[in-house]
């Protein structure tokens, strides 16, 4: 079998499980003249041997924990022992088996934790070692808390990092641990190898005693600080304290302020470093952090709240240098002219910002003084004595005193007397006709210009025109902007047009003034205009309801089972035809009309899950536009694969005659899904007639040992049938054959006379 077990001298690597009695030659090196023999050097440990004919084997079980890799060299020598080929490196990698149990470094651990410590922050580590390979499950340790004493309300206060053994508080532990109630706890911790995932794992336990200590690392009460303090700064405002001396304190400004007016010293005292201004910022929230000498946080940060108390340090301010109002001739007494709204930056709803309004002067005083009054607290101006005449006095100026409890400010108001609003806006056209637009016309496009005129006094609220769409556009797809100089209205698209929902819109515009019309005058038909907007269709591809459709079925569903469905809609309302793309395994079909997906062949999770195909939705008729979406079919495992041998076991042999009963180890596998604990095979002999000669015993869920029951075997090949059951639902059984040869051996390998070299068994026991 040139290549697998024999071949020329070249660098090679072999992997051999530790702990197994030699059952196989490793390799047969072939010599080229003048080479007549081989020499083995390196880390042989008197275990590895090469025979004169080039047969490399090992003579006793390997131990990975003694040496995980044997670096050997093989050289071909001539008849004088001189190297004629090589030496070449031969690497023996010793594969790990789980032959070492994990052991805790201490049988008892002691530690302490402060109440309210940060959840997840380790305060104690337990540590176990396992000599097995940490790169395999054999050496992968899994820590667990077996019990917590006392256990209050069935709540775990402690947790352990399964991989590192770090013990920390849970969220509940951080919140509820209280030394006054319960000052000490005991944990029993277990460690398992095999990553804790196998019932064949080894384990160890240890005890952990934990003392809970009081935590003085607590957030102080919120602080109130009066703004504009004239006291010397810095001023201590509060403090924090870490539980032990030596902590390094710092403040963290989460808001990233340009000016952060607080500091903390190494005692934990917190200071304000400069006067505060409530009007700049009325409250501060920042954090106090305690770190160890290496700059690592000792616990969670504490939130510090500082509220800035207001003082009356801001006078009222006018809304603008001059506030302009308009009043029509002949307006009636008591009519509102407008409201003067002054501001005060001091705190709202306090005496510091509560404002009073008073008219201190009116000019001109024609036909009399006191024509206007202002509501003391609201600032609303009203006509107090009589209607006004534009031709007598077209403009009045008022000086108004606005005051809070400490400050007074003068504001100026100009009141323009304007023509009465007795003219309504009149559209130059009552019907702007039809306008046809494609549904994909750009937002922001001006689609129409409208114009109304108003004969009232120009550039006053009586003649200014505002346009509104009062009918035909409930979706708000259109808007009208007015040019204040010309009163021209520009109709623009604000939202996308849609043929499918509004192919024809009958739009009605209304033109009105900001000023009220005089009593008795009303807007009539002249102030209304219409136009018809016709939206034309732009053909759009169908739209799937989802980008990815997902379904989950068992891999053993019957052919013809519905496994999922997809839906798409065509914006134009055309019918849709569904099809599949990329069904490489030919497992599925889709109903062209409904989008339902069915299985048309047996499904197989082991071939790959999820199974991904594309679904195509195509318009029927029209321009046959199409869209593509994904359909992912997740296949749930069914126990449908019988166990089998994990590798090729041809070439097993025992040296005849047997001096003592022998054994060999074999491994089984199957292709089904083994979550968490891995396969759980049971092993038995395949027929009753084998019982007298052979015995099979389980080592773990995947490995078993085949042993001879006696030493009286003939010099020939025996085929041993092994029954392997996977214990699944339903249980599946595989019958496998192990061919074992009993043969005469020379130096530990099967001897065959020259010319009878075929089929040499290559595994010796």
């Amino acid at each position: 079998q040139e290549g697998k077990f024999s071949g020329p001298l070249k660098p090679m690597t072999f992997s051999i499980y530790e702990g197994q009695e030699p059952s196989q030659i490793i390799f047969q090196f072939k010599a080229n003249p003048p080479a007549v023999t081989f020499e083995l050097t390196g880390e042989t440990d008197n275990i590895f041997v090469i025979e004169r004919e080039g047969l490399l084997y090992y003579n006793r079980a390997l131990d990975r924990e003694t040496r995980s890799t044997h670096n050997l060299q093989v050289a071909a020598l001539d008849a004088n022992g001189i190297i004629v080929e090589g030496p070449v490196p031969i690497t023996i990698k010793v594969k790990d088996i789980n032959d070492n149990r994990p052991t805790f470094l201490q049988s008892k651990y002691e530690g302490s934790v402060r109440q309210n410590s940060r959840p997840g922050k380790p305060f104690l580590y337990v540590n176990a070692t396992d000599l097995d390979d940490p790169a395999t499950p054999n050496g992968q340790l899994y820590y667990q808390i077996v019990i917590q004493l006392p256990m209050i309300n069935n709540v775990m206060y402690f947790q352990i990092n399964n991989k590192t053994g770090a013990i920390s508080l849970t969220r509940e532990g951080s919140q509820e641990l209280n030394p006054a109630k319960n000052p000490s706890y005991n944990l029993v911790i277990s460690v398992k190898d095999m990553g804790g995932q196998s019932e064949n794992s080894f384990s160890d336990t240890t005890s952990v005693d934990i003392i809970v200590t009081e935590n003085i690392w607590k957030a102080p009460k919120p602080v109130e600080m009066v703004e504009n303090s004239t006291d010397p700064h810095p001023i201590k405002i509060t403090q924090v304290r870490w539980n032990d001396p030596g902590a390094q304190y710092s403040l963290v400004d989460k808001e990233k302020l340009p000016r952060f007016p607080f500091s903390i010293d190494q005692e934990g005292d917190i200071y304000v470093t400069q006067p505060l201004d409530r009007e700049e910022k009325d409250a501060y929230v920042f954090y106090a952090v305690a770190k160890d000498e290496y700059g690592k946080p000792l616990s969670y940060p504490l939130e510090i709240h500082v509220k800035v108390k207001d003082i009356n340090d801001n006078p009222p301010t006018c809304p603008s240098p001059v506030t302009v109002f308009e009043v029509q001739e002949n307006e009636r007494l008591g009519n509102s002219i407008g409201t003067l709204t002054a501001h005060d930056r001091d705190e709202e709803n306090t005496a510091n910002s509560f404002l009073n309004y008073r008219i201190v002067e009116q000019t001109p005083k024609l036909p009399m003084d006191g024509l206007f009054l202002i509501q003391t607290y609201a600032g609303m101006l009203q006509l107090a004595k009589q209607s006004l005449k534009k031709q007598d006095t077209p403009q009045y100026n008022l000086t108004i005193e606005v005051s809070d409890k400490d400050f007074k400010t003068l504001c100026f108001v100009q009141i323009n007397v304007i023509d009465i609003n007795d003219q309504i806006p009149i559209f130059e056209k009552s019907d702007y006709g039809n306008l046809t637009l494609a549904e994909d016309t750009n937002i922001g496009s001006t689609i129409l210009t409208i114009q109304a005129t108003d004969a009232d006094e120009p550039f006053t609220g009586s003649s200014k025109i505002l346009y509104h769409i009062i009918k035909g556009d409930s979706e708000g797809r259109l808007g009208v902007d007015t040019d204040p100089h010309t009163n021209t209205g520009y109709v623009i698209i604000k939202k996308p047009l849609d043929f499918e929902t509004a192919a024809v819109s009958n739009i009605v515009f209304k033109a009105e003034n900001p000023e009220p019309l005089v009593f008795g005058v009303k807007y009539n038909a002249s102030s209304f205009a219409k136009f018809t907007l016709i939206v034309t269709d732009v053909n759009e591809a169908p739209q799937f309801s989802q980008h990815v459709f997902q379904a989950k079925v068992s891999e053993d569903v019957a052919i013809g089972t519905k496994v999922g469905n997809v839906t798409a809609k065509d914006p134009e309302g055309l019918d849709i035809s569904y099809s599949l793309r990329g069904d490489t395994r030919g497992w599925l079909k889709i109903d062209h009309v409904t989008g339902e997906i069915f299985s048309v062949a047996p499904l197989d999770r082991e071939a790959g899950s999820p199974y991904r195909v594309q679904v195509v939705a195509t318009e029927v008729g029209g321009s046959s536009l199409s869209s593509v979406s994904e359909f992912h079919l997740i296949l749930m495992d069914v126990n449908d694969n019988p166990p089998r041998l994990a590798k090729d076991y041809t070439g097993l042999f025992f040296c005849h005659p047997l001096s003592a009963p022998g054994s060999l180890i074999f491994e089984a596998t199957d292709d089904d899904q083994h979550l968490f604990r891995g396969p759980h095979f049971t092993f038995s002999l395949g027929s009753g007639s084998l019982q007298n000669d052979w015995e099979v015993s389980k080592i773990n869920g995947t490995h078993a040992r085949l042993s001879t029951r006696h030493t009286e075997f003939e010099e020939r090949e025996y085929v041993v049938l092994i029954r392997i059951n996977d214990g699944g639902r339903p249980p599946l059984e595989g019958i496998v054959s192990l061919p074992v040869t009993f043969c005469s051996c020379v130096e530990g390998s099967c001897f065959r006379p020259a010319g009878h070299q075929t089929g040499i068994p290559t595994v010796g026991m």
Epitope: V36, T41, Q73, A79, N80, G81, I82, I83
Partner: antibody
Framework: QVQLQQSDAELVKPGASVKISCKVS????????IHWMKQRPEQGLEWIGY????????KYNEKFKDKATLTADKSSSTAYIQLNTLTSEDSAVYFC????????????WGTGTTVTVSS | DIVMTQAAPSVPVTPGESVSISCRSS???????????LYWFLQRPGQSPQVLIY???NLASGVPDRFSGSGSGTAFTLRISRVEAEDVGVYYC?????????FGAGTKLELK
């Protein structure tokens, strides 16, 4: 016991050839290599080459490649060296020696054969 | 080719005393298997050579234990303790690490 019996001394004329024998006894002839050495009074010892009687494989010192030919007769357990185109430079004592397989050293030397090249 | 050097053509010695004969090689004779491929033999006057030491320090069968070999990869010593009259002859070192095998010029042991 192991013995290597070489042929008697030879007096040969320049330009002629000579064939010296080395008959072994006391072991299996094909198990070990036979080496030939040349010894001249002033030149010391020189290694000529070896033959492996099992398969007839030979290896020569480059210096003697055109001078010496090594052969072996398994049936008589005898190794031979033939020296051709002899000159006075070839006058010397020629030794055969067994190189002990597995231990790798000359454990037994032949009795030596003196070759004199003279006209 | 590896050059073997025996610096002393002869060494005089009084019977019963010890003597050391040295040999150097132009290349290390130590191989990765830990063996040093150096060979010592004696040629008594008018006789064939006979083995003394193989692989630098191994005493050949039948050789008195008055003979011992030592050395490093390139410097070697043959030591004879309590020299006897029958030890007279030429002592040669030889390397057999690689072809061609090469010999030292020999060191003649003479009795005082």
């Amino acid at each position: 016991q192991v013995q290597l019996q070489q042929s008697d001394a030879e007096l040969v004329k320049p330009g002629a050839s000579v064939k010296i024998s080395c008959k072994v006894s006391g072991y299996t002839f094909t198990d070990h290599t036979i080496h030939w050495m040349k010894q001249r009074p002033e030149q010391g010892l020189e290694w000529i080459g070896y033959i492996y009687p099992r398969d007839g494989y030979t290896k020569y010192n480059e210096k003697f490649k055109d001078k010496a030919t090594l052969t072996a007769d398994k049936s008589s357990s005898t190794a031979y060296i033939q020296l051709n185109t002899l000159t006075s430079e070839d006058s010397a004592v020629y030794f055969c020696a067994r190189f002990y397989y597995g231990y790798w050293y000359f454990d037994v030397w032949g009795t030596g054969t003196t070759v004199t090249v003279s006209s | 080719d590896i050059v073997m050097t025996q610096a002393a053509p002869s060494v005089p010695v009084t019977p019963g005393e010890s003597v050391s004969i040295s040999c150097r090689s132009s290349k290390s004779l130590l191989r990765s298997n830990g063996n040093t491929y150096l060979y010592w033999f004696l040629q008594r006057p008018g006789q064939s050579p006979q083995v003394l030491i193989y692989r630098m320090s191994n005493l050949a069968s039948g050789v008195p234990d008055r003979f011992s070999g030592s050395g490093s990869g390139t410097a070697f010593t043959l030591r004879i303790s309590r020299v006897e009259a029958e030890d007279v002859g030429v002592y040669y070192c030889m390397q057999h690490l690689e072809y061609p095998f090469t010999f030292g010029a020999g060191t003649k042991l003479e009795l005082k």
